[in-house]
């Protein structure tokens, strides 16, 4: 039946069946022969969206995915072998997983896969033009993947290819202990994270890295890393995860005579997602799931949306949290952790700090360091030894804008549209989860723009069989979201505005802000449409101001929904 | 110049326990990891131990393990081997090694070496 | 038993060309690990003579070079000198349990 739009009830409730009889899910349900439909790539430009899978990369028509081209990249026979003989699983092991597949050029992508335990990249050529119609391998073209895949498929990895130049966060080795973040390709040698030091990165899960433009000058650039990580001794009592944001300088090519082509201005600190608990304690939300920055506006300042996990046996919960890159900065510029050996506490570190402070770039703009060679040897050894920051980066509001803590499932994904309202703008998330359905959930701005309140606006099972949702993308053009899991591919509609009922009232209830009564139905609202009649309320979802004008449908009789 | 050189080898009976050290110059010592590599008489090269810059991370071949300790002092330019309860196996010429990471995937090379200590483990 | 595999000796007139070869396995070169070579004169410490598969340290002469392929590794050598006469050890890391390992090393006699 109807809802309204409490937290925990979704307006509308569609299982699989209902989603495909409404025409709301188009599947496509996976080859036999491959899987793990996990690395995706949307480019809204050619209206294609790019697939990593299990031997497979697909070039699906954002259109349609029912229209797709596909090309087959598996491994030798000789290479399987080799993999089974080392004591692979032959299925869930001894193939080609892509995990990179990123832009390289106007006319090529750049792949990367596990090759059965040996990394693998080359390249794809997708023509200069959509109408070129070009989807093919490089095969003359083969590059050693370490540093850019991992060897083993289970592991994640995050990666940006800007400027020629690919940056991952990945497993360098064959039983994946060595993680690091590095700089492979272009015309420099390799740079990474220190080898052999827990304080740099310790047993990490990477999620995704961005690029943020911290000035107008270009040598400011900076590139940050999502990742989850153990947190180091003597940060926690028992073992914990840490959830954290990295940074690393564009222009970072390593140091002279110590950190040689090792990164000399990366820092990470805490991410916070977190509610009071009992006793006064907090509750923390720290298994980092999924990252998306919502550009508007300002590329230099993106908000970033972060889905959490709990890492508690006892208590399973999820959360999105909402970070400021503001915050973010200001806990880059604040102090270092430091201790003074294995047995000691962190504490902010309080001696004098080097200049130019660590983790600033190189540039014209800051002390005149044209290069990180060039940095004074007190710096160097300074950030070799303090790649922490003390002070945690706290979300918006000091709390998560979305929990959910008494369901079957948790959170592993988010996308983020900005839609254009009636009353104003509004953030509509999509989430998905580990049982394959998808939450769509708009944050209402109440007294202050970052104090929100969360409208569950649905609740659509878009796979089959319950499977965990492994990534999705958003195209804003077609208006149509797509989903990836082991099993498949989906595409769905990002309102359903039909669905919400046959009248003003219900048309309001629903909060939608894609939606609102045209006076014969409830329908995709366009804030360049100059009709009069639209009626619409998000911000506090009241038909009885909005449909009980003159030539607006004003029942308010309740029809039985999806649920 | 980088010059590593060894010392504390000799002669001692099985069962025995043996100090080594390796006195470091030419380079920021505190900068690189550092190894053991034997080599038993008319026989090929065995790594041994390995030591981040910092003593983070410490490893030992299987042969040696939870008889053989590592350590450095970076202070003194200065690595250690700790050997105890050695065996006839252990005799052969210990080199102190430099690991130079030169190659694009950061693989453990052996850049610089001392010219080797001889132990000798005999009754 | 060394973990990667060395003909143990190798020889050739001088001015000739020479090739020793390294065989390892999915875990160690074939797992795309780089393969080092030292060079050990009679009595001397070793030396290194390329790292990083077919790269060679300042000082190292250009008659020496290293290539790589799948499971396994070469050296070749060209121009052969008295001079070359050596043992020559390849070395890779092992990613099972990770730690530098050598093959068994290769003797190089230059005839004549």
């Known amino acids: 039946n109807y809802q309204n739009g409490k937290n925990n009830v979704p307006r509308l409730k569609l299982s699989y069946k209902e989603m495909l009889e409404s025409n709301n899910v188009i599947t496509f349900n996976g080859l036999a022969n491959s899987s793990s439909y996990h690395t995706f790539l949307l480019d809204e430009e050619r209206s294609r969206l790019y697939v990593g899978a299990k031997d497979h990369i697909f070039s699906f028509d954002l259109v349609n995915i029912k229209d797709f081209q596909k090309i087959v990249w598996p491994v030798s026979y000789t290479r399987r072998d080799e993999c089974k003989w080392a004591g692979k699983d032959i299925l869930k092991e001894c193939a080609n997983f892509i995990k990179v597949l990123k832009a390289y050029n106007q006319t090529h992508l750049y792949a990367c896969g596990t090759g059965a335990f040996h990394p693998i990249c080359t390249y794809i050529e997708i023509g200069h033009h959509p109408e070129d119609n070009i989807f093919k391998l490089e095969n003359s073209h083969f590059e050693n993947g370490r540093g850019k895949s991992p060897y083993d498929p289970k592991l994640l990895t995050a990666s940006l290819l800007i400027d020629g130049e690919l940056y991952s966060g990945t497993a360098a080795d064959f039983m994946g202990r060595d993680f690091a973040i590095f700089r492979t390709l272009g015309h420099h040698h390799p740079i990474r994270t220190e080898q052999h030091d827990s304080r740099w990165l310790n047993d990490p899960k990477f999620i995704s890295a961005h690029l943020i433009s911290e000035s107008d000058n270009p040598e400011d650039d900076k590139v940050y890393f999502f990742f989850r990580e153990n947190a180091i001794d003597g940060e926690h009592s028992g073992k914990a995860t840490h959830a954290r944001i990295g940074q690393i300088c564009k222009n970072d090519f390593g140091g002279h005579r110590s950190l040689v082509n090792k990164w000399t201005t990366f820092l990470k600190a805490r991410l916070i997602c977190s509610v009071p608990g009992p006793n006064g304690i907090d509750t923390h939300f720290d298994e980092l799931q999924d990252v998306f920055l919502m550009n508007f506006k300002d590329p230099k300042n993106p908000v970033v949306y972060g889905v959490f996990t709990t890492s508690s046996n006892i208590f399973k919960g999820s959360a999105v949290c909402m970070y400021s890159m503001s915050d973010v900065r200001r806990v880059f510029l604040g102090p270092y952790a430091h201790r003074d050996g294995p047995n000691y506490q962190w504490v902010p570190y309080q001696g004098r700090v080097p200049y130019p402070r660590p983790g600033t770039c190189p540039s014209k703009t800051f002390g005149g360091f044209d290069s990180t060679k060039d940095l004074p040897d007190d710096v160097i050894t300074f950030a070799r030894s303090h790649p922490a920051m003390y002070n945690p980066v706290f979300p918006m509001n000091n709390r998560p804008i979305v929990i959910k803590t008494d369901v079957n499932y948790q959170f592993t994904q988010i996308v983020v549209d900005r839609v254009d309202a009636e009353d104003g703008q509004y953030d509509v998330m999509f989430i998905g989860t580990d049982v394959g359905t998808v939450l769509k959930v708009v944050s209402i701005p109440k007294e202050t723009w970052y104090d929100l309140e969360e409208v569950l606006l649905e609740e659509m099972t878009v796979f089959r069989e319950p499977t965990a949702i492994s990534a999705m993308e958003l195209s804003t053009k077609q208006q149509q979201l797509y989903i990836g899991s082991t099993a498949g591919v989906a595409q769905l509609p990002l309102h359903r505005c039909d669905i919400y009922g046959k009248a003003c009232a219900e048309c309001c209830l629903a909060r939608d802000p894609y939606c609102a009564w045209d006076g014969s139905a409830c329908s995709r609202y366009f804030p360049t449409a100059k009709a009069r009649t639209r009626a619409q309320d998000i911000r506090n979802g009241d038909p009885l101001t909005h449909c009980s004008d003159g030539g607006i449908e004003g029942r308010m009789d309740h029809h039985h929904h999806h649920h | 110049e980088v010059q590593l050189l060894e010392s504390g080898g000799g002669l001692v009976q099985p069962g025995g326990s043996l100090r080594l050290s390796c006195a470091a110059s030419?380079?920021?010592?505190?900068?690189?990891?550092m190894n053991w590599v034997r080599q038993a008489p008319g026989k090929g090269l065995e790594w041994v131990s390995g030591i981040s810059w910092n003593s983070g991370w410490i490893d030992y071949a299987d042969s040696v393990k939870g008889r053989f300790t590592i350590s450095r002092d970076n202070s003194k330019n200065t690595l250690y081997l700790q050997m105890n309860s050695l065996r006839a196996e252990d005799t052969a010429v210990y080199y102190c090694?430099?690991?130079?990471?030169?190659?694009?995937?950061?693989?453990?090379?052996?850049?610089?070496w001392g010219q080797g200590t001889l132990v000798t483990v005999s009754s | 038993q060394s973990v990667l595999t060395q003909p143990p000796s190798v020889s050739g007139a001088p001015g000739q060309r020479v090739t020793i070869s390294c065989t390892g396995s999915s875990s160690d070169i074939g797992a795309g690990y780089d393969v080092h070579w030292y060079q050990q004169l009679p009595g001397t410490a070793p030396k290194l003579l390329i790292y990083g598969n077919s790269n060679r340290p300042s000082g190292v002469p250009d008659r020496f070079s290293g290539s790589k392929s799948g499971t396994s590794a070469s050296l070749a050598i060209t121009g052969l000198q008295a001079e070359d006469e050596a043992d020559y050890y390849c070395?890779?890391?092992?990613?099972?349990?990770?730690?530098?390992?050598f093959g068994g090393g290769t003797k190089l006699t230059v005839l004549g």
């Open positions: 090694a430099r690991s130079g990471y030169s190659s694009s995937w950061f693989d453990p090379d052996f850049d610089y």
């Open positions: 070395s890779s890391y092992e990613g099972i349990n990770p730690y530098v390992v």
């Open positions: 030419g380079f920021d010592f505190d900068s690189y990891e």
